[in-house]
């Protein structure tokens, strides 16, 4: 008799999930000498232990603590780049500006980036058919809780000047419901952080508006100010030129506004 299986609204676990996590871990530890001590099998066991045999709507931050411990890593606290709805450019930037780090430049962020996973209560199976959707099913699902946990820890670690890259092409440049808006903003520590500097990335080539005056940016400024942290904002009018100038800062065209 086929066993009844819960049908969730979201896509199922990414195919070859265990193999992908293990392969990513091995690759990361090879590229980053300071993480060569990490035992990737133990990392996978801890990752698996966070969600296997547990109800996928009843996952807690505590479930991920063994994984967090194994993924302990050094990131200079004054070199943190947060992002919202503009992941690709943020990652292109840190690939060039090697001394700055997004969450996905850390081991745990790298392991889980773009993946989906969930299990089933009381069975050791991974559910490849469907996983809970944050809105339609439940917020305490394995993927959402993972990102909430690592994002909170990343924000809590930040110090001095923290940068955030925001997508100026979206209707809500700052979105309170994004991971940045709902988790990271509220976990920056005023004892550690002096300033949050937003970089608003323009989409259109002829877009010369000051998007730092956008109502959602003003909302972000208000939230940050209420945390007793300074706020500043810069328009990045030409993201292509911005990246080029990060690569070649001595280029004569890089003295003008980008």
């Amino acid at each position: 008799v086929p066993r009844w299986r819960q049908q969730w609204s979201g896509p199922g676990t990414t195919k070859r999930f265990p193999e992908t996590v293990l392969a990513r871990c091995v690759k990361y530890t090879e590229i980053h000498p300071e993480m060569r001590h990490v035992d990737c099998q133990s990392v996978w066991d801890a990752f698996k232990g966070a969600f296997i045999s547990k109800h996928p709507c009843n996952i807690t931050e505590e479930d991920y603590q063994p994984l967090m411990k194994l993924g302990t890593q050094t990131v200079p606290c004054n070199k943190i780049l947060l992002w919202s709805r503009i992941k690709d450019l943020a990652h292109q930037f840190t690939q060039v500006q090697r001394d700055m780090f997004t969450l996905e430049d850390t081991l745990l962020g790298y392991l889980a980036d773009d993946l989906t996973w969930c299990g089933e209560f009381n069975t050791s199976k991974i559910n490849y058919q469907s996983c809970p959707d944050w809105r339609k099913d439940c917020s305490n699902n394995p993927v959402s809780v993972f990102w909430k946990t690592v994002s909170r820890r990343f924000a809590e670690a930040a110090c001095d000047v923290v940068h955030v890259m925001l997508n100026g092409s979206r209707s809500k440049i700052f979105d309170k419901n994004s991971t940045f808006g709902s988790v990271e903003v509220h976990n920056l520590q005023p004892e550690k952080v002096q300033t949050l500097e937003a970089w608003v990335i323009h989409g259109g080539r002829e877009d010369s508006r000051d998007l730092c005056q956008d109502p959602t940016i003003k909302e972000l400024e208000s939230i940050i100010s209420k945390r007793n942290i300074q706020f500043s904002c810069k328009n990045i009018y030409r993201p292509d030129k911005f990246l080029q100038c990060v690569k070649n800062p001595e280029d004569s065209s890089c003295t003008s506004e980008i």
Epitope: T74, T106, C159, P190, E191, R227, N228, Q230
Partner: antibody, heavy 114, light 111 residues
Framework: QIQLVQSGPELKKPGETVKISCKAS????????MNWVKQAPGKGLKWMGW????????TYADDFKGRFAFSLEASASTAYLQINNLKNEDMATYFC???????WGQGTTLTVSS | DIVLTQSPPSLAVSLGQRATISCRAS??????????IHWYQQKPGQSPKLLIY???NLESGIPARFSGSGSRTDFTLTINPVEADDVATYYC?????????FGAGTKLELK
């Protein structure tokens, strides 16, 4: 340059109230929270809590809930510490210290004696 | 609450010698490998003065005779060589989480 200037020494009787001020200059007052720290005579430093200078919301350490109150006059860039119903064990030097950056006031000595 | 245990409580050092002060935390004060421990110097009748921030960074204007090291739970302040002006009490402070806490202090004297 950044300065935190506190009010002068206080001599009070048990049961009375004292209000200590801390005037900030050299930076935007509402950009940084203000910590309060107690140092009893010959003793170490103890964090009392802090006040958010933008929202005026205070946070008190467990040992300083009840008789202690942090407040602000933001327009004057000044933070206040008020202690009600003074007790002998309140006799100490009280420091204000800006959050982020290691800036401290010179301290205000409170003597409680009948 | 994170408890910071300083040792020794007092220390007598000859001029020109090295002084080493230890600070041990009851739990890690690291976040992503950044140690949120500061070191302060306090002279009688004065407010504390920041010497070292985040375990090993020398505050502007502080002589290079002062250095800090350590991670997670074990931290050290070193003064080498000790000068007469260094006679004071030294405190470690953790700012990784509320409540902020201080060590009990180490009193440095001259031999």
């Amino acid at each position: 340059q950044i300065q935190l200037v506190q009010s002068g020494p206080e001599l009070k009787k048990p049961g009375e109230t004292v209000k200590i001020s801390c005037k900030a200059s050299g930076y935007t007052f509402t950009n940084y929270g203000m910590n309060w720290v107690k140092q009893a005579p010959g003793k170490g430093l103890k964090w009392m809590g802090w006040i958010n200078t933008y929202t005026a919301e205070p946070t008190y350490a467990d040992d300083f809930k009840g008789r202690f109150a942090f407040s602000l006059e933001a327009s004057a860039s000044t933070a206040y510490l008020q202690i009600n119903n003074l007790k002998n064990e309140d006799m100490a030097t009280y420091f204000c210290a800006r959050k982020y950056g290691g800036y401290w006031g010179q301290g205000t000595t409170l003597t409680v004696s009948s | 609450d994170i408890v910071l245990t300083q040792s020794p409580p007092s220390l007598a050092v000859s001029l020109g010698q090295r002084a080493t002060i230890s600070c041990r935390a009851s739990e890690s004060v690291d976040s992503y490998g950044n140690s949120f421990i500061h070191w302060y110097q306090q002279k009688p009748g004065q407010s504390p003065k920041l010497l070292i921030y985040r375990a090993s960074n020398l505050e502007s204007g502080i002589p290079a005779r002062f250095s800090g090291s350590g991670s997670r739970t074990d931290f050290t302040l070193t003064i080498n060589p000790v000068e007469a002006d260094d006679v004071a009490t030294y405190y470690c402070q953790q700012v990784n989480e509320d409540p902020l806490t201080f060590g009990a202090g180490t009193k440095l004297e001259l031999k």
